[in-house]
C-alpha cells in the first residue's frame, strides 16, 4: 500500500460498497501523486477503532460516545477532522445539551431530586447519557441497576426504550415508554412536549430543540436553562449554560504517526468534488443504500481539527465526567458540600518545589501538578487534572477562550482593604539603558529585545500590538535584529539571546534564565537594547534588592523608559511614560470549581499572605527572591473580583480588544483549539 | 547553607520496614519545611512527604498510612519510618529543606530503597 493511501475502515457491507466507490471517484479526480483511500470492513466500530490503533486501518467516522472509546487506552486515537451542519459561513460541528425548564418553576440543577424528568430516550445523549452522567454522584445508592437508581432519584419520569415492568417509574410520565414516535414524548421535540404539557419539570434535550419546536420568541421566553453552576439563563444562551458541548460526528486517527495531515488532504479533496451540491455521480453525504454510510448525511463538509486538541479537550471536561461517571461508576467519598484539594498548576521544577512546599503547609488542602508551559497547565485545568493557577492577563485571554473564568486578582499595593478592592492594574513599560541615549520608541527596528514570555501581556500582547499596528505585519522577528522571547519558535531570531542551555532555550518557563519579568530585565542588563517590562521590575532588580550576581550592583539610575511619544523618562515617571495599563495577573479555575478554589485561596493566604513577617522560618505563598514562582512576588494579597468574574470583564474591553486584534500573529495552538470549540 | 545526608536505605522484601535518616550539618531549628522525595528509574521526582517546623506532616496519597515523617530539631535529623513497603517504593530517596528552591535543582546523594522479593 503506497504512502499516501488512507484506508478508511467500514463497518457493513453498505458501508464497505460506499468506500469502494468513494476509493474509484477520487482515483479519477486525483492526480496519481496525490492521497488515495483503501477500504477495510470490520464487524464494528470498536473493531475498527482497535483495527486503527494497531495499524491496519487509519481512519473511521465516530460519534461522541465512541470517540472517547477511541481516547482510550490502549487505544489512543485523536480527532483529526470534523464533519459540519449548517451553512460553511456559520458551521456548526458541536450541539450543546441542555436541561430545559419552565420559567416559573424556582429550582436549580442541585434541586432536582424529587422533580419529574423528559428524556429523549434510554442511553440516549443528551437526552440520558449526559444528564445522568453529571447527576450520577448525586443518585440513590446503590446505583446499579442504573435505571432504578434514576427512577429512585427522579419522583417519575418518561425515558423511552426503558423497560416498563421492570422500572416502571421511569414510564411513569409516557406510558409504556414506547421507543418510537407512536410514543409522543419520544425523541428531542418528544421530551419537549412532555415538558410543555406539564408532565415533567425538566427536560433533557439539544439546543437546538426549543427553536425547532417553539418558532416564536415570546413562547420560548416562557422557558429557561438550568445551569451547572446552579444559575438558570434565557434558551439562547445555550452556550454559556449547557450539561456538555458535544461533537456531532468525528474522524479518528491514531495519535501517533496518524496520518492527520493525509487525511485531512484527501477528506478537503473529497468535499470539494463530492461535498454538498458538487457531483451527480457520486456524493460524500448521502447514503442510497442506507442512512449515514461512512459520513452523515445532514453533513454539509469537513473542518480540521486543531492539532494541539486530544479527544479530552475535544469531547470537553462536561461530557468526559458524565460518560467517564456512567462507565466507571465511581463517585468520591467525600460529602459534595466538602472542597476537595485543590490541585494546583506548579511550571517546571522551580514552581513545583514551591508549590510542594505550599502542599506540605497547607495540610494537604494544596496538591500539585506540574506542566513545562502555561498552555499545557491551561488544557490540564481544563480537562480536570489541575484546578488552578495565577496567570498574566494575556494568558487569562487564552485560558477565558477555553472556557476558564477568573476567580480571584493578585494585588500590588498595601491598601486597609485589600482584599475587597482588586486593583486597575499595573503599567506596561520599555526599558532601556541609559546609555543608549539614541534609542526611542520610533527607532527600535533593528534593535536587540527582550520580552518576559510570547503571549504575555506586558512583554509580548501590548508591545507587539502596538508595533503590529505600525509596521501592519506579525513577523516581529524580522523587525527586531535578535531577541530573547521565551515561547518562539526555536529556529527564530526571538530566541537567539536567550540562555537557557539545551532543549531549555528559550523555553517559557523558569528553566530558561531570561524568561519572566526578572529574566527579561536581566536580558536587557547582559545582552539587549530593549526590554517590555512591568513598572516595578526595574526598582525590584536595583539597589541591591536581587542578590543574584547579575543584579546585586545594579542601579536604577542607568535606565530609563521609552514613551509613546518618541521621548524618554526616569524609570520612577511610569505612570507618564508607559505602553499601556495591564491587567493585573488572576487565578483562573473552571467554573465548577470557582467556589472551592476562592474558598481555599482566601484561607491560605490569611495563613501565608503578606501577614507573615519572617519568609526565612516560614512558608511565604508571595515570595520566591525575584523568581515569581505561582505568584508575583511583589503581591499584596488575593482579591475578590466581584462582579469581574469572566475573562472579558476582567481584562476589560480595550485589552480584549487589543488581544484580539493581535490573534492574526498568534501562534498559540491553544487557542487555536479552544476557538475551534467556541468560535 | 545546611548541607543534607540521607542514610538508611537498603534492601528489604515487599511487607517489610526501613527507616531512612537525614543528618543536617547545620541546624535545621530555624528551616520552615523539612520533605522527603524520591525518584525511581526514568520518573519524575516526587514529594514523599513533608513536615513544618511546628511538627505538622503530609503525604503522599500512594503512601500514607504506611509512611511516618518526624524531625528531631535537637539532633537535626529529620527521618522516615516506611512501613508496609512495596515493590513500586523501590526508588533513590532525597531528603531537602526548600531553602535552595528558588536556584536550582541542588540535591543530595540520595539512598537507594529497593523493595524485591
Known amino acids: 500500500v503506497p504512502d499516501k493511501t488512507v484506508r478508511w475502515c467500514a463497518v457493513s457491507e453498505h458501508e464497505a460498497t460506499k468506500c469502494q466507490s468513494f476509493r474509484d471517484h477520487m482515483k479519477s479526480v486525483i492526480p496519481s501523486d496525490g492521497p488515495s483511500v483503501a477500504c477495510v470492513k470490520k464487524a464494528s466500530y470498536l473493531d475498527c477503532i482497535r483495527a486503527i490503533a494497531a495499524n491496519e486501518a487509519d481512519a473511521v467516522t465516530l460519534d461522541a460516545g465512541l470517540v472517547y472509546d477511541a481516547y482510550l487506552a490502549p487505544n489512543n486515537l485523536k480527532p483529526v477532522v470534523a464533519e459540519f451542519y449548517g451553512s460553511k459561513e456559520d458551521p456548526q460541528t458541536f450541539y450543546y445539551a441542555v436541561a430545559v425548564v419552565k420559567k416559573d418553576s424556582g429550582f436549580q440543577m442541585n434541586q432536582l431530586r424529587g422533580k419529574k424528568s423528559c428524556h429523549t430516550g434510554l442511553g440516549r445523549s443528551a437526552g440520558w447519557n449526559i444528564p445522568i452522567g453529571l447527576l450520577y454522584c448525586d443518585l440513590p445508592e446503590p446505583r446499579k441497576p442504573l435505571e432504578k437508581a434514576v427512577a429512585n432519584f427522579f419522583s417519575g419520569s418518561c425515558a423511552p426504550c426503558a423497560d416498563g415492568t421492570d422500572f416502571p417509574q421511569l414510564c411513569q410520565l409516557c406510558p409504556g415508554c414506547g421507543c418510537s414516535t407512536l410514543n409522543q414524548y419520544f425523541g428531542y421535540s418528544g421530551a419537549f412536549k412532555c415538558l410543555k404539557d406539564g408532565a415533567g419539570d425538566v427536560a433533557f434535550v439539544k439546543h437546538s430543540t426549543i427553536f425547532e419546536n417553539l418558532a416564536n420568541k415570546a413562547d420560548r421566553d416562557q422557558y429557561e436553562l438550568l445551569c451547572l453552576d446552579n444559575t438558570r439563563k434565557p434558551v439562547d444562551e445555550y452556550k454559556d449554560c449547557h450539561l456538555a458541548q458535544v461533537p456531532s460526528h468525528t474522524v479518528v486517527a491514531r495519535s501517533m504517526g496518524g496520518k492527520e495531515d493525509l487525511i485531512w488532504e484527501l477528506l478537503n479533496q473529497a468535499q470539494e468534488h463530492f461535498g454538498k451540491d458538487k457531483s451527480k455521480e457520486f456524493q460524500l453525504f448521502s447514503s442510497p443504500h442506507g442512512k449515514d454510510l461512512l459520513f452523515k448525511d445532514s453533513a454539509h463538509g469537513f473542518l480540521k481539527v486543531p492539532p494541539r486538541m486530544d479527544a479530552k479537550m475535544y469531547l470537553g471536561y462536561e461530557y468526559v465526567t458524565a460518560i467517564r461517571n456512567l462507565r466507571e461508576g465511581t463517585c468520591p467519598e467525600a460529602p459534595t458540600d466538602e472542597c476537595k484539594p485543590v490541585k494546583w498548576c506548579a511550571l517546571s521544577h522551580h514552581e513545583r518545589l514551591k508549590c510542594d512546599e505550599w502542599s506540605v503547609n497547607s495540610v494537604g488542602k494544596i496538591e500539585c501538578v506540574s506542566a513545562e508551559t502555561t498552555e499545557d497547565c491551561i488544557a490540564k485545568i481544563m480537562n480536570g487534572e489541575a484546578d488552578a493557577m495565577s496567570l498574566d492577563g494575556g494568558f487569562v485571554y487564552i485560558a477565558g477562550k477555553c472556557g476558564l473564568v477568573p476567580v480571584l486578582a493578585e494585588n500590588y499595593n498595601k491598601s486597609d482593604n485589600c482584599e475587597d478592592t482588586p486593583e486597575a492594574g499595573y503599567f506596561a513599560i520599555a526599558v532601556v539603558k541609559k546609555s543608549a541615549s539614541d534609542l526611542t520608541w520610533d527607532n527600535l527596528k533593528g534593535k536587540k529585545s527582550c520580552h518576559t514570555a510570547v503571549g504575555r501581556t506586558a512583554g509580548w500582547n501590548i508591545p507587539m500590538g502596538l508595533l503590529y499596528n505600525k509596521i501592519n505585519h506579525c513577523r516581529f522577528d524580522e523587525f527586531f535584529s535578535e531577541g530573547c522571547a521565551p515561547g518562539s519558535k526555536k529556529d527564530s531570531s526571538l530566541c537567539k539571546l536567550c540562555m537557557g542551555s539545551g532543549l531549555n532555550l528559550c523555553e517559557p518557563n523558569n528553566k530558561e534564565g531570561y524568561y519572566g519579568y526578572t529574566g527579561a530585565f536581566r536580558c536587557l542588563v547582559e545582552k539587549g537594547d530593549v526590554a517590555f517590562v512591568k513598572h516595578q521590575t526595574v526598582p525590584q532588580n536595583t539597589g541591591g534588592k536581587n542578590p543574584d550576581p547579575w543584579a546585586k550592583n545594579l542601579n536604577e539610575k542607568d535606565y530609563e523608559l521609552l514613551c509613546l511619544d518618541g521621548t524618554r523618562k526616569p524609570v520612577e515617571e511610569y505612570a507618564n511614560c508607559h505602553l499601556a495599563r495591564a491587567p493585573n495577573h488572576a487565578v483562573v479555575t473552571r467554573k465548577d470549581k470557582e467556589a472551592c478554589v476562592h474558598k481555599i485561596l482566601r484561607q491560605q493566604q490569611h495563613l501565608f499572605g503578606s501577614n507573615v513577617t519572617d519568609c526565612s522560618g516560614n512558608f511565604c505563598l508571595f515570595r520566591s527572591e525575584t523568581k515569581d514562582l505561582l505568584f508575583r512576588d511583589d503581591t499584596v494579597c488575593l482579591a475578590k473580583l466581584h462582579d469581574r468574574n469572566t475573562y472579558e470583564k476582567y481584562l476589560g474591553e480595550e485589552y480584549v480588544k487589543a488581544v484580539g486584534n493581535l490573534r492574526k500573529c498568534s501562534t498559540s495552538s491553544l487557542l487555536e483549539a479552544c476557538t475551534f470549540r467556541r468560535p | 547553607q545546611v548541607q543534607l545526608v540521607e542514610s538508611g536505605g537498603g534492601l528489604v522484601q515487599p511487607g517489610g520496614s526501613l527507616r531512612l535518616s537525614c543528618a543536617a550539618s547545620?541546624?535545621?531549628?530555624?528551616?520552615?519545611?523539612m520533605a522527603w522525595y524520591r525518584q525511581a528509574p526514568g520518573k519524575q521526582r516526587e514529594l514523599v512527604a513533608g513536615?513544618?517546623?511546628?511538627?505538622?506532616?503530609n503525604y503522599a496519597g500512594s503512601v500514607k498510612g504506611r509512611f511516618t515523617i518526624s524531625r528531631d530539631n535537637a539532633k537535626n535529623t529529620v527521618y522516615l519510618q516506611m512501613n508496609g513497603l512495596k515493590p513500586e517504593d523501590t526508588a533513590v530517596y532525597y531528603c531537602?529543606?526548600?531553602?535552595?528552591?528558588?536556584?536550582?535543582?541542588?540535591w543530595g546523594q540520595g539512598t537507594q530503597v529497593t523493595v524485591s522479593s
Open positions: 513536615i513544618t517546623r511546628s511538627g505538622t506532616t
Open positions: 531537602t529543606d526548600y531553602s535552595r528552591r528558588y536556584y536550582q535543582d541542588d
Open positions: 547545620g541546624s535545621i531549628f530555624s528551616i520552615n519545611t
